[in-house]
């Protein structure tokens, strides 16, 4: 009686179970009553990452430098190429099909989390007592200078964009 289901790594064709091709290989011909499944290795720049019955291998992803991409991990016959972004850029999606420049944190904001190849810069406002006077993709908010520890007095209070201005003691009103 012909089978209705096959074991793992097999497929049903013409009322019989044939072996699937292993990762890195494509199907050339199905098995018969007398012959095994015929498989062939994928060519250069091709891959198949599962046990399969595909007649064509997939092309490796191309990391287009014009889109800011570079190869993070070269593909094999069993794995696709993994792209990432050039330094200072990050992927626009999980598939990393293109890149955008890392965001800079404006004055008054500091970097909470530095960008990676897959995530943008996260900025946070500088709270009272801290400042950032630059637009930067890596600078955190800096604490205001303590004039007292320098034996000076505050001439002008700091803001979220400027440090305290210290001056000599005799400036005290």
């Amino acid at each position: 009686e012909p089978p209705t289901a096959c074991r793992e790594k097999q497929y049903l064709i013409n009322s019989q179970c044939c072996s699937l091709c292993q990762p890195g290989q494509k199907l050339v011909s199905d098995c018969t009553e007398f012959t095994e499944t015929e498989c062939l290795p994928c060519g250069e720049s091709e891959f198949l990452d599962t046990w399969n019955r595909e007649t064509h291998c997939h092309q490796h992803k191309y990391c287009d430098p014009n889109l800011g991409l570079r190869v993070q991990q070269k593909g094999t016959s069993e794995t696709d190429t993994i792209c990432t972004c050039e330094e200072g850029w990050h992927c626009t999606s999980e598939a990393c099909e293109s890149c955008v420049l890392h965001r800079s944190c404006s004055p008054g904001f500091g970097v909470k989390q530095i960008a990676t190849g897959v995530s943008d810069t996260i900025c946070e406002p500088c709270p009272v007592g801290f400042f950032s006077n630059v637009s930067s993709a890596f600078e955190k908010c800096h604490p205001w200078t303590s004039c007292e520890t320098k034996d000076l007095v505050v001439q002008q209070a700091g803001t979220n964009k400027t440090d305290v201005v210290c001056g000599p003691q005799d400036r005290l009103r």
Partner: antibody, heavy 122, light 113 residues
């Protein structure tokens, strides 16, 4: 101990100005911030502005910008809040409070004056 | 400006009850550099000036009874009175001090049931 003593109640006519004082003692007045907060009858707390007496640096809430002036006299450890162009909606209790002490790590208001009632009425 | 929203606006409770007041900020009050939440809680009784209870969201001000506690981080904060005492019937305010202008919640009145 830290103390903030405010001037007495005032009754003012609409269009006039009021100047409330806040005399500080028991801490270094010049480096600490003095904050001004008001509370209209039956209402919540509303921050108006602040001053660091030693530097004369001030911050004002947008709502009061141009109508409030906060000053301080370090020789008498007294801060002042002047509100001009008074209207009936300015009827409130005005409080001074101590903010940061110059350490930049304690911006909350740990000591308050007793409050000054300002009544604006024609 | 950072908006502070308190709830409920009033609560009726009995002596011995556990009372919880919440406060929500329109933006995070947690600063990553020092891992501090820039939030304070105050108590105000009729005709009196407000009194500081809690600062940095969870630090108890000196002299404040331990039945008061503060918790929360980022945008959501809670003031808890574990066992309400007769002297705790008052209005409670949250306030942020992250950046100017400082703003207060609208207040929560704790009334006798």
């Amino acid at each position: 101990q830290v103390q903030l003593v405010q001037s007495g109640a005032e009754v003012k006519k609409p269009g006039s100005s009021v100047k409330v004082s806040c005399k500080a003692s028991g801490y270094t007045f010049s480096t600490s911030w003095i904050e001004w907060i008001r509370q209209a009858p039956g209402q919540g707390l509303e921050w108006m502005g602040s001053i660091q007496p030693g530097s004369g640096s001030t911050n004002y809430a947008q709502k009061f910008q141009g109508r409030v002036t906060i000053t301080a006299d370090t020789s008498t450890s007294t801060a002042y809040m002047e509100l001009s162009s008074l209207r009936s909606e300015d009827t409130a209790v005005y409080y001074c409070a101590r903010g940061d002490d110059g350490s930049y790590v304690r911006w909350y208001f740990d000591h308050w004056g007793q409050g000054t009632l300002v009544t604006v009425s024609s | 400006d950072i908006q502070m929203t308190q709830s409920p606006s009033s609560v009726s409770a009995s002596v011995g009850d556990r009372v919880t007041i919440t406060c929500r900020a329109s933006q995070s009050l947690l600063f990553s550099v020092n891992q501090k939440n820039y939030l304070a809680w105050y108590q105000q009784k009729p005709g009196k000036a407000p009194k500081l209870l809690i600062y940095w969201a969870s630090s108890l001000q000196s002299g404040v009874p331990s039945r008061f506690s503060g918790s929360g981080s980022g945008t959501d904060f809670t003031l808890t009175i574990s066992s309400l005492q007769p002297e705790d019937f008052a209005t409670y305010y949250c306030q942020h001090y992250y950046s100017y202008p400082w703003t207060f919640g609208q207040g929560t009145k704790v009334e006798i049931k």
